[in-house]
C-alpha cells in the first residue's frame, strides 16, 4: 500500500521571500528504494487553471522546472519527497501536488500554498495645517500580503490603564497596491492636544492574517505639545 | 541570524536521565531536520540521529536505539533529546546540528551541552 | 554500518603548506560526503558538501575531491586559522557515519 500525505489541514502559509518546505511524506509498506521510484511535483496556480511541472525526480535523473526546486534525495530514503522553493514570491501561492510512483503504485496529494508578507509599521506626527492645541498622528502600514488589514486606535490614561479603543477622528485611508504586488495603507487619528491628559498613551494596533500578534506603536501625550520623539517620528515598529 | 542555542551543563548520576534543549531562530524550524551528535572527551564525532521538527519523523543509531527519545515543540521552535538509563561512558558534549537543506551534512550547531555522568 | 577511515589521524605542518587529507568508505557512498573543520572547545564547521562542493563562507583555499569509496580535503595554502582537526561524514546510507578525525598540528 502506497500513502502521501500533506499539510494537515490542506494549507500551508509561508512569508513571502522564504526558503519554503512544502511538506509530502511518503508511507509504504516496504523500505524505499529511490532508484526505482518516482517523484513529480506539480503546481497549480490561483488565476489560471492550468498545471505545471515544478519538479520531477526518477531514478537517477532529477529536473527543476522552477528555478532552485529541489527534493532531496537523502531525504527520500526515509519517505520525505517535501519540495523546496527558496525565495518563494507572492504570483507562486496556488494548489501543489505531489505525486509518487512506486511501480506499479501511484499516490499523490495536494497542498494550497499561501504566501504572506507581513507589515512594516511607523507613526509619523503630521502638523502641517493643523489647527493650534491640534495634530495628526499618521500610522503607515507597508509592505503587507493579502490585502485586507485592521488598523485601529487605542489609548491608555492612568485612570484607565485598560486599552480603550477610539473611534472618534480616525480616518483610514484606501489601500494602495505597490509595484511588487504588497500593500500600503495609511490611517490618521486627529487628537486635541488640549482635552487631552499628559500621560496618555496612544496606540496604533495592526492585525493581519501574516502575523501572530498584533503590530502595536505607540507614542506617550506629554504636557508639552507635539510630544512624539524623533525615533517615533521615523522608526519602524516591527 | 540562524542559529542553535542549547540548555546548560549537567550532572548525572548512572542509570538517571538527561534532556538536553535546543532552540532554533532566524528561520522556519519545521522546514530543516535537526540532527542530534556527540563527543566524548578526547574523542570524535559520532552521530545519534535525527527528528523531523515537521512530522515528528525520528531516526536513530543502532546504539542508542531504546535508550534516546527526540522530539520538538513547534510552538517554541525547539528540540529535544532524551537519553535515559546514563552510563558512565555517555559523559560527552551533545551537540544538536541543522542539516543543510536536502542532505546529510550540518550547516549549523548548537553550542554544546556537557553532560557528566558521576556517581 | 559504512565505516569511514580517516588518515593520517594527525599531521604537522607549517603555514603555507599544502595539506590532503584522505577519507575511505567501506562500501561505494556516490558522493554523499561532508567535510568538518572543528578547533578546541567548539562546535564543529561545515567545510565541504556533497564531497565537492563549498559552503558559503568557507575560504576558497579548502577543496574536496572524490566520489565512491575514496575521498580527499586538501588545504592549498595553510592559514593559522587551519590548526584544527578534521572530520568527513558520510550520509548516504543510516546510521550517518563520521571518520575518526584528522588533526592539524603546527610544525
Known amino acids: 500500500d502506497l500513502k502521501v500525505e500533506m499539510m494537515a489541514g490542506g494549507t500551508q502559509i509561508t512569508p513571502l521571500n522564504d526558503n519554503v518546505t512544502i511538506f509530502c511524506n511518503i508511507f509504504y509498506s516496504q523500505p524505499l528504494n529511490i532508484t526505482s521510484m518516482g517523484i513529480t511535483w506539480f503546481w497549480k496556480s490561483l488565476t489560471f487553471d492550468k498545471e505545471v511541472k515544478v519538479f520531477e525526480f526518477f531514478g537517477d535523473h532529477q529536473e527543476a522546472f522552477r528555478p532552485g526546486a529541489i527534493v532531496s534525495p537523502w531525504r527520500l530514503k526515509s519517505g520525505d519527497a517535501s519540495l523546496r522553493l527558496p525565495g518563494i514570491q507572492l504570483e507562486e501561492a496556488g494548489e501543489y501536488r505531489c505525486e509518487v510512483v512506486v511501480t506499479p503504485l501511484k499516490a499523490q496529494g495536494t497542498v494550497q500554498l499561501e504566501v504572506v508578507a507581513s507589515p512594516a509599521s511607523r507613526l509619523l506626527l503630521d502638523q502641517v495645517g493643523m489647527k493650534e492645541n491640534e495634530d495628526k498622528y499618521m500610522c503607515e502600514s507597508s509592505g503587507f500580503y493579502p490585502e485586507a488589514i485592521n488598523i485601529t486606535w487605542e489609548k491608555q490614561t492612568q485612570k484607565f490603564p485598560h486599552p480603550i479603543e477610539i473611534s472618534e477622528d480616525v480616518i483610514t485611508g484606501p489601500t494602495i497596491k505597490n509595484m511588487d504586488g504588497t500593500f500600503n495603507v495609511t490611517s490618521c487619528l486627529k487628537l486635541n492636544s488640549s482635552q487631552e491628559d499628559p500621560g496618555t498613551v496612544y496606540q496604533c494596533v495592526v492585525r493581519h492574517a501574516s502575523l501572530h500578534t498584533p503590530l502595536r506603536s505607540n507614542f506617550t501625550l506629554t504636557a508639552a505639545r507635539h510630544s512624539l520623539s524623533e525615533t517615533e517620528k521615523t522608526d519602524n515598529f516591527s | 541570524q540562524v542559529q542553535l542555542v542549547q540548555s546548560g551543563a549537567e550532572v548525572k548520576k548512572p542509570g538517571a536521565s538527561v534532556k538536553v534543549s535546543c532552540k532554533a531562530s532566524?528561520?522556519?524550524?519545521?522546514?530543516?531536520?535537526i540532527h542530534w551528535v556527540r563527543q566524548a572527551p578526547g574523542q570524535g564525532l559520532e552521530w545519534m540521529g535525527w527528528?523531523?521538527?515537521?512530522?515528528?519523523?525520528?531516526n536513530y543509531a543502532q546504539n542508542f536505539q531504546g535508550r534516546v527519545t527526540m522530539t520538538r515543540d513547534t510552538s517554541i521552535s525547539t528540540a529535544y533529546m532524551e537519553l535515559s538509563r546514563l552510563r558512565s561512558d555517555d559523559a560527552a558534549v551533545y551537540y544538536c546540528?541543522?542539516?543543510?537543506w536536502g542532505s546529510g551534512t550540518f550547516n549549523i550547531w548548537g553550542q554544546g551541552t556537557m553532560v557528566t555522568v558521576s556517581s | 554500518a559504512i565505516q569511514m577511515t580517516q588518515s593520517p589521524s594527525s599531521l604537522s605542518a607549517s603555514v603555507g603548506d599544502r595539506v590532503t587529507i584522505t577519507c575511505r568508505a567501506s562500501?561505494?557512498?556516490?558522493?554523499?560526503l561532508g567535510w568538518f573543520q572543528q578547533r578546541p572547545g567548539k562546535a564543529p564547521n561545515l567545510l565541504i558538501y556533497?564531497?565537492?562542493s563549498l559552503e558559503s563562507g568557507v575560504p576558497s583555499r579548502f577543496s574536496g575531491r572524490g566520489s565512491g569509496t575514496d575521498f580527499t580535503l586538501t588545504i592549498s595554502s595553510l592559514q593559522p586559522e587551519d590548526f584544527a582537526t578534521y572530520y568527513c561524514?558520510?550520509?548516504?546510507?543510516?546510521?550517518?557515519?563520521f571518520g575518526g578525525g584528522t588533526k592539524v598540528e603546527i610544525k
Open positions: 546540528a541543522r542539516e543543510r
Open positions: 532566524g528561520y522556519t524550524f519545521t522546514g530543516y531536520y
Open positions: 527528528i523531523n521538527p515537521h512530522s515528528g519523523a525520528t
Open positions: 562500501q561505494d557512498i556516490r558522493n554523499d
Open positions: 556533497a564531497a565537492s
Open positions: 561524514l558520510q550520509y548516504y546510507n543510516h546510521p550517518l557515519t
